[in-house]
C-alpha cells in the first residue's frame, strides 16, 4: 500500500482466483484513543471500533472511503483504491490501446517545435467517475523539471456503438535547451482513477522523436506566363522553432488529381517555393519535416489548382 | 577550415557534408525510429557517446559569440563515431551488406572531421569505450543504438553548419 496523495492510498493486488487479499491497517488520524468507530462510503453501519481498523482488501467491494468517527464527528478519512496485477502485468482497463506506432501504446505525444513544449493525449470509452493526473520529468534517476497542466477532455467521437473520449495535456520543460542534443528522455506518467480502480501509464521519448511541425502557412500559387506550370510558395509555420537558418525544414510538394487513383507527382525541396505542373481539377499540397532528423511529417496544407 | 587558433571553417562545405551525413545516417538504419531501443537497457556504449549539450555553445547565440567551443565538441563526436563505425561492432559478424551506407557514413565522418581539423592541429578527442559484444545479436543491437545516437548528433551538427553557412560565412 502506498499514498497517492493526502488521505488517498493505493492497494496493489495480485488478481488471480486463489490470491490471498492484502491485509491493510487503517489508523485514525486523531489524538483520541477511545470511542472511535469506522464506516465505509455512504453507509452508516459500523465496520469496527478502535483507533486502528484491520481489513482484508481483495475486491473492489473492500475499497472506498473509510471514515473514522467519534460521537457523530468525523475524525479522518482514508480512500482506498485498487491497482490490479494480473499474471505479473498491471491492468490497463481504463485507457484504450492506440496501437500506433506499436501495440500497447496508451499515451501518444507530439511537439510542434524544439521549445520543450509538447502535448500528450489518450483515449478511453469511460465517460464518468474518471480523473487523471499527469507528471513529467527529463530523465528518471536525477529528474529535471517538466511542468504539466491539467488533463482536459479534448474530443469526443462515436466509434460504432461506442463513444470514445480523448483527453490531452500540455507540458513544458522548465529549462529547455532547443539546440542541444537530448541525451535523457522525457518521462511522462499518467495516473488514472476510475471509480475505485487505479492505473498508471508511462511514456518515454526524446522531443526530437515526437516532432511534428504544423503545416506550412500562406500556401500560394503564381501561374507562370505561357506555361501550364505554376510557382507554389509557402512559409514556415509560426509555431516552428527559430531562427529558420538553424531549425530548418524540408518540404514535400504534391500534385493530386481529383481521383485518389490518379498518379501523384511529388517534389522534395528545402526551399519555400517550387515549380510544378498544375493539372485541371487537381490540388497542390505541401507538408513539412525537420530537415535533419526524420521525425513526423506535418499534415498537408492544400490549395486547388484552379 | 577550423583552425584551433580560431579562424572560421569552410561553413558551406561543412554544411553540405553534414547534410549528407544526416541522409546517410537515416539510410543506414531508416526503421530504427520504430524500435524503442531504450527498452533494451542502456549499456555503456550509448551512455558514453559525446552529446552536444546545452553549455557547448552550439545554439545560434553561442555560435555568434564564439563558434570554436561548439566546433571542438562536434569534432570530438565525429572522431568518436568514426572510430565506432570502424570498430568490430560494425566490421564483425553479422557482416554488413555490400551496399550498406555504413561505409559511406564512416568515410563522410572522417571527411567532415578533417574539414574541421586540418593536419597538424589537435583538439583533444574523447576516449572510445572498449566494446566487444560477444554475441552477434548484441552487436546488432549495439549498431542500432549507435546509429540512433548518431542520427541525433549529426542533426545538431547539420543545424550548426547550416546556420553558420547562412549567417557566419565571410
Amino acid at each position: 500500500i502506498w499514498e497517492l496523495k493526502k488521505d488517498v492510498y493505493v492497494v496493489e493486488l495480485d488478481w488471480y482466483p486463489d490470491a490471498p487479499g492484502e491485509m491493510v491497517v487503517l489508523t485514525c488520524d486523531t489524538p483520541e484513543e477511545d470511542g472511535i468507530t469506522w464506516t465505509l462510503d455512504q453507509s452508516s453501519e459500523v465496520l469496527g471500533s478502535g483507533k486502528t481498523l484491520t481489513i482484508q482488501v481483495k475486491e473492489f467491494g473492500d475499497a472506498g472511503q473509510y471514515t473514522c468517527h467519534k460521537g457523530g464527528e468525523v475524525l479522518s478519512h482514508s480512500l482506498l483504491l485498487l491497482h490490479k496485477k494480473e499474471d505479473g502485468i498491471w491492468s490497463t482497463d481504463i485507457l484504450k490501446d492506440q496501437k500506433e506506432p506499436k501495440n500497447k501504446t496508451f499515451l501518444r505525444c507530439e511537439a510542434k517545435n524544439y521549445s520543450g513544449r509538447f502535448t500528450c493525449w489518450w483515449l478511453t470509452t469511460i465517460s464518468t467517475d474518471l480523473t487523471f493526473s499527469v507528471k513529467s520529468s527529463r530523465g528518471s534517476s536525477d529528474p529535471q523539471g517538466v511542468t504539466c497542466g491539467a488533463a482536459t477532455l479534448s474530443a469526443e467521437r462515436v466509434r460504432g456503438d461506442n463513444k470514445e473520449y480523448e483527453y490531452s495535456v500540455e507540458c513544458q520543460e522548465d529549462s529547455a535547451c532547443p539546440a542541444a542534443e537530448e541525451s535523457l528522455p522525457i518521462e511522462v506518467m499518467v495516473d488514472a482513477v476510475h471509480k475505485l480502480k487505479y492505473e498508471n501509464y508511462t511514456s518515454s521519448f526524446f522531443i526530437r522523436d515526437i516532432i511534428k511541425p504544423d503545416p506550412p502557412k500562406n500556401l500560394q500559387l503564381k501561374p507562370l506566363k505561357n506555361s501550364r506550370q505554376v510557382e507554389v510558395s509557402w512559409e514556415y509555420p509560426d509555431t516552428w522553432s527559430t531562427p529558420h537558418s538553424y531549425f530548418s525544414l524540408t518540404f514535400c510538394v504534391q500534385v493530386q488529381g481529383k481521383s485518389k487513383r490518379e498518379k501523384k507527382d511529388r517534389v522534395f525541396t528545402d526551399k519555400t517555393s517550387a515549380t510544378v505542373i498544375c493539372r485541371k481539377n487537381a490540388s497542390i499540397s505541401v507538408r513539412a519535416q525537420d530537415r535533419y532528423y526524420s521525425s513526423s511529417w506535418s499534415e498537408w496544407a492544400s490549395v486547388p489548382c484552379s | 577550415r577550423a583552425v584551433p587558433g580560431g579562424s572560421s571553417p569552410a561553413w558551406t562545405q561543412c554544411q553540405q557534408l553534414s547534410q549528407k551525413l544526416c541522409t546517410l545516417a537515416w539510410s543506414a538504419h531508416p526503421l530504427v525510429g520504430h524500435m524503442d531501443l531504450r527498452e533494451e537497457g542502456d549499456e555503456e556504449t550509448t551512455n558514453d557517446v559525446p552529446h552536444i549539450q546545452c553549455g557547448d555553445g552550439c545554439d545560434p547565440q553561442g555560435l555568434r559569440d564564439n563558434s570554436q567551443f561548439c566546433l571542438q565538441r562536434i569534432h570530438q563526436g565525429l572522431i568518436f563515431y568514426e572510430k565506432l563505425l570502424g570498430s568490430d561492432i560494425f566490421t564483425g559478424e553479422p557482416s554488413l551488406l555490400p551496399d550498406s551506407p555504413v561505409g559511406q557514413l564512416h568515410a563522410s565522418l572522417l571527411g567532415l572531421s578533417q574539414l574541421l581539423q586540418p593536419e597538424g592541429h589537435h583538439w583533444e578527442t574523447q576516449q572510445i569505450p572498449s566494446l566487444s559484444p560477444s554475441q552477434p545479436w548484441q552487436r546488432l543491437l549495439l549498431r542500432f543504438k549507435i546509429l540512433r545516437s548518431l542520427q541525433a548528433f549529426v542533426a545538431v551538427a547539420a543545424r550548426v553548419f547550416a546556420h553558420g553557412a547562412a549567417t557566419l560565412s565571410p
Epitope: 490471498p20 465505509l40 462510503d41 453507509s43 453501519e45 465496520l47 481498523l53 475486491e59 467491494g61 472506498g64 | -
Partner: antibody, heavy 119, light 107 residues
Framework: EVQLVQSGAEVKKPGESLKISCQSS????????IGWVRQMPGQGLEWIGI????????RYNPMFRGQVTMSVDKSSSTAYLQWSSLKASDTAMYYC????????????WGQGTMVTVSS | EIVLTQSPATLSASPGERATISCRAS??????LAWYQQKPGQAPRSLIY???NLQSGIPARFSGSGSGTDFTLTISSLEPEDFAVYYC?????????FGQGTRLEIK
C-alpha cells in the same frame, strides 16, 4: 434494520428453470457484495459465490460455475440466483447473505429458500 | 481449495460448562476466519470474524482465538440457547470454504 428477504419455497421438475430472489433493505445496497450459500438436506454449508451490486462483478466457486447464475438488479436492491435446467441434486436450502467489506465473511443472512427438484 | 476440519463432530455439554470447538485449515488462512451458529430451521448467524472479533450483538461469553491454521471457538459458560450447530469459514482464498460443522448438544 438490515434485512435480506428471500422468495418462497419452490418445487420443480428436473430440466425446468428457476430464479430465486433476495431483496435487501436497511443498508446501503451498493456498498456490500451479496453472496449465496447452499445447504443440502442434513448437510453443511457450501459457498456458491459472491457478486458486486455495483458492476455485477462475480466470483464463483468453481464447483458451481456453469451450474448457476448470479445476477443483481440495483434499482430494486435485489439479488438473484438462477438455474436454466434443474437437477434432483440441486435440492437444497439456498441462503443469500451480505458480505462484510474489508473482511469477506457474511454478516447478515436471508431466511433461506428451499428448492425441491423431483419428478 | 482450503479444507477446514472441525473437531469434535459432536460435543455434549451441560449448561454452565465451558465448551471449546476446534477448526484446522489445510493451509494458512492468516486470521481471516469466521464462526457461525445455526439452529434448526434457521439461517446461520455470524458470531466471530477475523478469528477473534466479536460480531455486534453477540454475547461476550463467545470468543475466538488462533491464526494461521489452528483456530478455536470458546463458549465460557453455556446457556440453553447455545445448543446448535457451529461452522467455521475461511475467507482468505477463493473459493471460501466452511468446516463440516460441530453439533453442540445438551448432555
Amino acid at each position: 434494520e438490515v434485512q435480506l428477504v428471500q422468495s418462497g419455497a419452490e418445487v420443480k421438475k428436473p430440466g425446468e428453470s428457476l430464479k430465486i430472489s433476495c431483496q435487501s433493505s436497511g443498508y446501503s445496497f451498493t456498498t456490500y457484495w451479496i453472496g449465496w450459500v447452499r445447504q443440502m438436506p442434513g448437510q453443511g454449508l457450501e459457498w456458491i459465490g459472491i457478486m458486486s451490486p455495483v458492476d455485477s462483478d462475480i466470483r464463483y466457486n468453481p464447483m458451481f460455475r456453469g451450474q448457476v447464475t448470479m445476477s443483481v438488479d440495483k434499482s430494486s436492491s435485489t439479488a438473484y440466483l438462477q438455474w436454466s435446467s434443474l437437477k434432483a441434486s440441486d435440492t437444497a436450502m439456498y441462503y443469500c447473505a451480505r458480505r462484510r467489506p474489508g473482511q469477506g465473511y457474511f454478516d447478515f443472512w436471508g431466511q433461506g429458500t428451499m428448492v425441491t427438484v423431483s419428478s | 481449495e482450503i479444507v477446514l476440519t472441525q473437531s469434535p463432530a459432536t460435543l455434549s455439554a451441560s449448561p454452565g460448562e465451558r465448551a471449546t470447538i476446534s477448526c484446522r485449515a489445510s493451509q494458512s488462512v492468516s486470521s481471516w476466519l469466521a464462526w457461525y451458529q445455526q439452529k434448526p430451521g434457521q439461517a446461520p448467524r455470524s458470531l466471530i470474524y477475523s478469528a477473534s472479533n466479536l460480531q455486534s450483538g453477540i454475547p461476550a461469553r463467545f470468543s475466538g482465538s488462533g491464526s494461521g491454521t489452528d483456530f478455536t471457538l470458546t463458549i465460557s459458560s453455556l446457556e440453553p440457547e447455545d445448543f446448535a450447530v457451529y461452522y467455521c469459514q475461511q475467507y482468505n482464498i477463493y473459493p471460501y470454504t466452511f468446516g463440516q460443522g460441530t453439533r453442540l448438544e445438551i448432555k
